[in-house]
Amino acid sequence: KKVVLGKKGDTVELTCTASQKKSIQFHWKNSNQIKILGNQGSFLTKGPSKLNDRADSRRSLWDQGNFPLIIKNLKIEDSDTYICEVEDQKEEVQLLVFGLTANSDTHLLQGQSLTLTLESPPGSSPSVQCRSPRGKNIQGGKTLSVSQLELQDSGTWTCTVLQNQKKVEFKIDIVVLAFQKASSIVYKKEGEQVEFSFPLAFTVEKLTGSGELWWQAERASSSKSWITFDLKNKEVSVKRVTQDPKLQMGKKLPLHLTLPQALPQYAGSGNLTLALEAKTGKLHQEVNLVVMRATQLQKNLTCEVWGPTSPKLMLSLKLENKEAKVSKREKAVWVLNPEAGMWQCLLSDSGQVLLESNIKVLPTWSTPVQP
């Protein structure tokens, strides 16, 4: 007996071939001997089966000796043995219909779990193997679960159902709702404008929700809500904004915030949360601001940074085109009695400059100039 695997909702074609390449009489029946369809001369006739308007043949193939039974919008209950009677012969085909569905929404928040459920006909014993977009394989029976979804799990999951040494492939598109980056850091000189961007790692037709940016300044004892906003069909509207600092927010995606000036009192880290409509849980992105200031007071040239810096970052003071006068893994460095010239304060990581501030030291009778 030939075995054919079908997918729920799909179309299947069961073949029946005669030795003669001409149109002859044929009949398709199910295991209960109920006629599904057949022919009477040139005409296709239908029986009283439950397939009714979902079954057809292809008239143009009959004179090739092919008498297919085509079933559309397959259901699990269509699983059965189908018999084709042609030329005093009986051809039996066992059709097994499977369905694979994500038993929650296919749009899931980062960190949530994905459960895939296999629908199968009674008496079948299929095995399922799914491959995630990042190449991770998971195996199971009737259900497969993946906990702690990551951004790389977004995309097409390919699941193979095996039964009777035959296989049928399902493709399920999963969208992991997350920001493109879990964390970002912005380095700015004091007084510069700061741009924070929070690009999403997914695109959907309509995006509605609400969000807030909480800020923990390094100098402050507690965190503070800097801005709250609403998102409606990808349009951003500010609900409430703190007076200090006076943040501005873009009206369109990606979420974009502008801080007019980088000041030491703003240096610190923030957490932007976004709650999406009809979703439990929130999307998070951490953002950090590091601010640099270079000053000369009397005979002391000082360079300072505020904000979350890693211990391996190096802060240096050097006269232009010369070796560093001072270089430390600290948040403040200084030079006493600096020579006249253009001094550079550099914040670097393994030789890569992250932030640079220049200050001109004039001969002792002048006051310093910041370019």
Epitope: D10, T11, V12, E13, T15, L37, S42, F43, L44, K46, D53, R54, A55, D56, S57, R58, R59, S60, L61, W62, D63, Q64, N66, P68, I70, K72
Partner: antibody
Framework: EVQLLESGGGLVQPGGSLRLSCAAS????????TSWVRQAPGKGLEWVSS???????YYLDSVKGRFTISRDNSKNTLYLQMNSLRAEDTAVYYC?????????????????WGRGTLVTVSS | DIQMTQSPSSLSASVGDRVTITCRAS??????LNWYQQKPGKAPKLLIY???TLQTGVPSRFSGSGSGTDFTLTISSLQPEDFATYYC?????????FGPGTKVDIK
């Protein structure tokens, strides 16, 4: 968007070979019979070949043994390998999807066509 | 193979005219007949299937009739966008064959 997009056409000498591709998108490709239909310059339409959902193949007598139709459902792509090309094979080759009516009478039609790719066989 | 013929091979008509195109099969094909419209440089477009069923989205000024060997495509009131070539096709047997086409142009 539901569409078919042909590629692979070009100028080839008599006796040469070409492989045409047709990329399907926006529908379940594996559920449909798919065909190649050609149209010689200034002439009418001529069916060339069809492939069924199970991979069964049908050809116009004049291309049998020279042309091979195939499909890759994982790539949603239909192919036509054309060998021993002749001047009379010069035409725009269209990829077309066959739709079954499900009237219970075996009616079908070409309900979706690609834009076509030109094959010129000339020395 | 089933041969399909069409008449006329071309016709000139004006906007608003009623246009009739006929298609004949070399043997009985019952109602296994489709009609397509093709504009220059474009792919064909399905108008009617099973001899008389209008494809979704096709204007109701198009209609098809006939059975057996003789079929008709009628455009009740010709519109500027209807100037094109029309083909009939049988799907009764393989190979599915097309008629040679009828070109409808502006008078």
């Amino acid at each position: 968007e539901v569409q078919l997009l042909e590629s692979g056409g070009g100028l080839v000498q008599p006796g040469g070979s070409l492989r045409l591709s047709c990329a399907a998108s926006g529908f379940t490709f594996s559920n449909h019979y798919t065909s190649w239909v050609r149209q010689a310059p200034g002439k009418g339409l001529e069916w060339v070949s069809s492939i069924g959902v199970n991979g069964d193949t049908y050809y116009l007598d004049s291309v049998k043994g020279r042309f091979t139709i195939s499909r890759d459902n994982s790539k949603n792509t239909l192919y036509l390998q054309m060998n021993s090309l002749r001047a009379e094979d010069t035409a725009v080759y269209y990829c077309a999807r066959e739709g079954l009516v499900f009237s219970g009478r075996g009616h079908w039609y070409f309900d979706l066509w690609g834009r076509g790719t030109l094959v010129t066989v000339s020395s | 193979d089933i041969q399909m013929t069409q008449s006329p091979s071309s016709l000139s008509a004006s906007v608003g005219d009623r246009v009739t195109i006929t298609c004949r099969a070399s043997r009985n094909i019952h109602d296994y007949l489709n009609w397509y419209q093709q504009k220059p440089g474009k792919a064909p477009k399905l108008l009617i299937y099973a001899a008389s069923t209008l494809q979704t989205g096709v204007p109701s000024r198009f209609s098809g009739s006939g059975s057996g060997t003789d079929f008709t495509l009628t455009i009740s009131s010709l519109q500027p966008e209807d100037f094109a070539t029309y083909y009939c096709q049988q799907t009764y047997s393989t190979p599915p064959t097309f008629g040679p086409g009828t070109k409808v142009d502006i008078k």
